[in-house]
């Protein structure tokens, strides 16, 4: 069974998938469509890297631009380095500026909804 066939079989169960499962899927050539991606749990999407999202979505990654103001894409963008987002070639804006340090302060993030940044 190839990645696309596997994805069709599990598609209906993906809404509650944890980050670990999404990372594993990104290695299997599944080409997840945008509609499915938009239904994923935000907390499961946030830890994914730009490279992992690119592999997870395949050609569907082109659709991220139209969804950049909507969750979970909007919140995911805020967590990525702008340099990494730039590699997607879509003009996605709102990432962490180059040279900034991300502090993983869970309480701070829970209160503000955004990661804590230290400037250069």
């Amino acid at each position: 069974m190839n990645g696309s066939e596997y994805f069709v079989k599990i598609q209906s169960f993906l809404g509650g998938a944890p980050t670990e499962d999404l990372k594993a899927l990104s290695q299997q050539n599944v080409s997840m469509d945008l509609a499915t991606f938009m239904k994923l749990r935000t907390d499961a999407v946030l830890p994914l890297t730009v490279a992992e999202v690119q592999k997870l979505l395949g050609p569907h990654v082109e659709g991220l631009k139209a969804e950049e103001r909507h969750r979970p894409v909007r919140d995911w963008i805020l967590r990525q380095r702008q340099d990494d987002l730039d590699t997607l070639g879509l003009g996605l804006q709102g990432g962490i500026p180059n040279g900034y340090l991300v502090l993983d302060l869970s309480m701070q993030e829970a209160l503000s909804g955004t990661p804590c940044l230290l400037g250069p």
């Epitope: 945008l34 569907h60 082109e62 631009k65 139209a66 070639g89």
Partner: antibody, heavy 121, light 107 residues
Framework: EVQLVQSGAEVKKPGASVKVSCKAS????????MHWVRQAPGQGLEWMGN????????YYNERFRSRVTMTVDKSTSTVYMELSSLRSEDTAVYYC??????????????WGQGTTVTVSS | DIQMTQSPSSLSASVGDRVTITCKAS??????IAWYQQKPGKAPKLLIH???ELQPGVPSRFSGSGSGTDFTFTISSLQPEDIATYYC?????????FGGGTKVEIK
């Protein structure tokens, strides 16, 4: 003003390869993927694939996957489409097209002027 | 891949006539369809996107409607300059597909 300027007409023999260029200007080149569409004489439009100008990653229509190669030169804001093992059925006008990402995956709002490729022995 | 079936493949109408072209998608594409006009030797020109949104500068005699799988493109009053071939494009999928085209001629 957005402009997509393509290379000139080509005449090739069966079995040869052709490389068509598309030079972009008037916008941030790395913010939009570039697509290629072809049109055989008297026929409709056929999507061939696209390329991410930022990292050079292409996605191809399955029909052309074994014969097409899309590349990018960021320094000159130019994308290239190379088609190999040419046959007479590849005689067509080849267009580059830029999408606008207003909704979903984006529709094409700007097109190159087209490059005529003739395959004949 | 999503197939786009466009009809008719050609039509002949008189100046002032109402002209209707349809495109049927092989699966639900929401409203993600665009319509293009192409004249001989020229690149396609975008007329309508998102089913019914007219591009700036495009005359209001052009319109579009539909959703899901069935879409309609209409020229309310055909003009001599509208002689061209018209194509639909679905962009609900990253692997874009076009309809087969409709050649519009004047009687």
């Amino acid at each position: 003003e957005v402009q997509l300027v393509q290379s000139g007409a080509e005449v090739k023999k069966p079995g040869a390869s052709v490389k068509v260029s598309c030079k972009a200007s008037g916008y941030t080149f790395t913010n939009y993927w570039m697509h290629w569409v072809r049109q055989a004489p008297g026929q409709g439009l056929e999507w061939m694939g696209n390329i991410n100008p930022s990292n050079g990653g292409p996605y191809y229509n399955e029909r052309f996957r074994s014969r097409v190669t899309m590349t990018v030169d960021k320094s000159t804001s130019t994308v290239y489409m190379e088609l190999s093992s040419l046959r007479s059925e590849d005689t067509a006008v080849y267009y580059c097209a830029r999408p606008y990402y207003g909704s979903s995956y984006g529709y094409f709002d700007y097109w190159g002027q087209g490059t005529t490729v003739t395959v004949s022995s | 891949d999503i197939q786009m079936t466009q009809s008719p493949s050609s039509l002949s109408a008189s100046v002032g006539d109402r002209v209707t072209i349809t495109c049927k998608a092989s699966q639900d594409i929401n409203k993600y369809i665009a319509w293009y006009q192409q004249k001989p030797g020229k690149a396609p020109k975008l007329l309508i996107h998102y089913t019914s949104e007219l591009q700036p500068g495009v005359p209001s005699r052009f319109s579009g409607s539909g959703s899901g799988t069935d879409f309609t493109f209409t020229i309310s009053s055909l003009q001599p300059e509208d002689i061209a071939t018209y194509y639909c494009l679905q962009y609900a999928n990253p692997l874009r597909t076009f309809g087969g085209g409709t050649k519009v001629e004047i009687k």
